[in-house]
């Protein structure tokens, strides 16, 4: 079982100066050093901040089930307890096909698995949506036109990693919320610098998480209840150098929907996320579809 002992403070004085400098410095990539100030964790300060068992970050990448780390707050032990010996990744024979046919309006049962991204919900048109709270915001170092050209592949791969369904959030006009990302500029810059045309260096992508099939699967205790927990999971994968996603991410975060939702009581560290998750799971299940809508 994970020890519940205090993490050491950052052992290297040099790491203080390296925090948040956009370089992942291996020697500073630890919880005590804040994952190099977020440089190694996609700017997520501490992906495991809600996890009471303090050693779960060490066990996250060991491909063994550590029950004390299998809670949502501990990022499901990287799904090590959930896999149950089954294949953890989409069958390579299907993967390209599933990416090409993701959310194309036709149900492909071979792709309708969590590890293949649930076929973009093509097999779940009659099942009501069950959205996780908030919006998952990714900054991708790819201009919007390029990212949108490969949108099906992008969403399929991300859905497969998170083992649930991802889709672009749509604006009032039904357009995908994918915006140009310009470098953030300090306010006190000289006039000459302000006059430079802003360089588009990526895209800000707003995503919704739809747990309708995740919550229907036999082991339905591993769905992300909110966008921030999904962002924490992606940050954790990045921190342990196991994020197999071919789109370069600058950062990830969860944002509440506008207008701000009322805060949930008991949302502190540790058990807070569990409480929120349990409450939402009851809500999801009560509003869930009748059994005959399941697609297997």
């Amino acid at each position: 079982a994970p020890e519940v002992s205090e993490e050491p403070r950052c052992p290297r004085a040099a790491c203080q100066a390296k925090r948040g400098d956009q370089r992942c410095d291996r020697e500073c990539n630890s919880p005590g050093c804040g994952w190099d100030g977020g440089d190694c964790s996609l700017s997520v300060g501490d992906p495991w901040r809600q996890c009471e068992a303090l050693q779960c970050w060490r066990l996250f990448n060991n491909s063994r089930c550590d029950p004390a780390c299998s809670s949502p707050a501990c990022l499901y032990d990287n799904f090590d307890c959930h896999a149950g010996g089954r294949e953890r990744t989409c069958n390579p024979v299907y993967e390209k096909y599933c990416a090409d046919h993701f959310a194309d309006g036709r149900c492909d049962q071979g792709c309708n698995t969590e590890e293949c991204g649930w076929d973009g919900l093509d097999c779940a048109s009659e099942v009501p949506a069950l959205l996780a709270r908030g919006v998952l915001v990714l900054t991708v170092l790819l201009p919007p036109e390029e990212l949108l050209r490969s949108s099906a592949d992008f969403l399929q791969r991300l859905s497969a990693i998170l083992r649930t369904s991802l889709r672009f959030r749509l604006d009032a006009h039904g357009q995908a919320m994918v915006f140009p990302y310009h470098r953030p500029s300090p306010g006190s810059e000289p006039r000459a610098r302000r006059e430079l045309a802003p360089e588009v260096i990526g895209s800000v992508v707003m995503l919704e998480i739809d747990n309708r099939l995740c919550l229907q699967s036999p082991e339905n205790d591993h769905c992300f209840p909110d966008a921030q927990s999904a962002a924490d999971y992606l940050g954790a994968l990045s921190a342990v150098e196991r994020l197999d996603f071919p789109y370069p991410l600058r950062d990830v975060r969860g944002e509440p929907l506008e207008p701000p939702e009322p805060s949930v009581p008991g949302g502190g560290s540790g058990g807070g996320l569990n409480d929120i998750f349990e409450a939402q799971k009851i809500e999801w299940h009560e509003g869930g579809p009748p059994h005959h809508h399941h697609h297997h």
């Epitope: 400098d21 370089r23 992942c24 410095d25 500029s185 197999d244 071919p246 370069p248 600058r250």
Partner: antibody
Framework: EVQLVESGGGLVQPGGSLRLSCAAS????????MTWVRQAPGKGLEWVAE????????NFNEKFKGRFTISVDNAKNSLYLQMNSLRAEDTAVYYC????????????WGQGTLVTVSS | DIQMTQSPSSLSASVGDRVTITCKAS??????IAWYQQKPGKAPKLLIY???NRYTGVPSRFSGSGYGTDFTLTISSLQPEDFATYYC?????????FGGGTKVEIK
């Protein structure tokens, strides 16, 4: 338009010193890490060192630590490489390049400046 | 430090050929690989970043693939202007090592 222009190369005797410069224009200089890469005649590319104009942080190829120093002058949008105790094997074309955010691929390079170390 | 090993070091091919160059990292580097093309007397040019993303303006005949330790640069149909030397480079963590290069020559 992003432009990087190196200067300062030339002939120097073994044991001597040389300071290379790279003038950057067309973008916000402090926003990007800057790098030196070198290439000996007929050989491959070799990463030397990088610096963040914003934080002053540096990373070096261990091979060059102690002999080479990387620095910037943000007021001049310029990058420098101070090379001391030069050896014949330091003969190479030295390129400056702009490292892209977080991952450090090099989309923009200078034209290179040739350093020849010979007696 | 992680080493990047390219193969072959040189190859001869004809216009229209499909050419594959490999780069092997001594440890897992995820997707953190870039590919460059260099012609004699010129600075390198970025072709592919983050293993599989084509840089702006790079022709679609160039593609990159791989994850972890094994990476491939493929030129689907070699053009006269593609005869050059190609390098892989490790991204994300210092040191940002380059592979030894692959020279593509005319057969």
């Amino acid at each position: 338009e992003v432009q990087l222009v190196e200067s300062g190369g030339g002939l120097v005797q073994p044991g001597g010193s040389l300071r290379l410069s790279c003038a950057a224009s067309g973008y916000a200089f402090t926003d990007y890490w800057m790098t030196w890469v070198r290439q000996a005649p007929g050989k491959g590319l070799e990463w030397v060192a990088e610096i963040s104009p914003n934080s002053g942080g540096t990373n070096f190829n261990e091979k060059f630590k102690g002999r080479f120093t990387i620095s910037v002058d943000n007021a001049k949008n310029s990058l420098y490489l101070q090379m001391n105790s030069l050896r014949a094997e330091d003969t190479a074309v030295y390129y400056c390049a702009r490292g892209e955010i977080r991952y450090n691929w090099f989309a923009y390079w200078g034209q290179g400046t040739l350093v020849t170390v010979s007696s | 430090d992680i080493q990047m090993t390219q193969s072959p070091s040189s190859l001869s091919a004809s216009v229209g050929d499909r050419v594959t160059i490999t780069c092997k990292a001594s440890q897992n580097v995820g997707n953190n690989i870039a590919w460059y093309q260099q012609k004699p007397g010129k600075a390198p040019k970025l072709l592919i970043y983050y293993a599989s993303n084509r840089y702006t303006g790079v022709p679609s005949r160039f593609s990159g693939s791989g994850y972890g330790t094994d990476f491939t640069l493929t030129i689907s149909s070699l053009q006269p202007e593609d005869f050059a030397t190609y390098y892989c480079q490790r991204l994300y963590n210092s040191p940002f090592t380059f592979g030894g290069g692959t020279k593509v020559e005319i057969k």
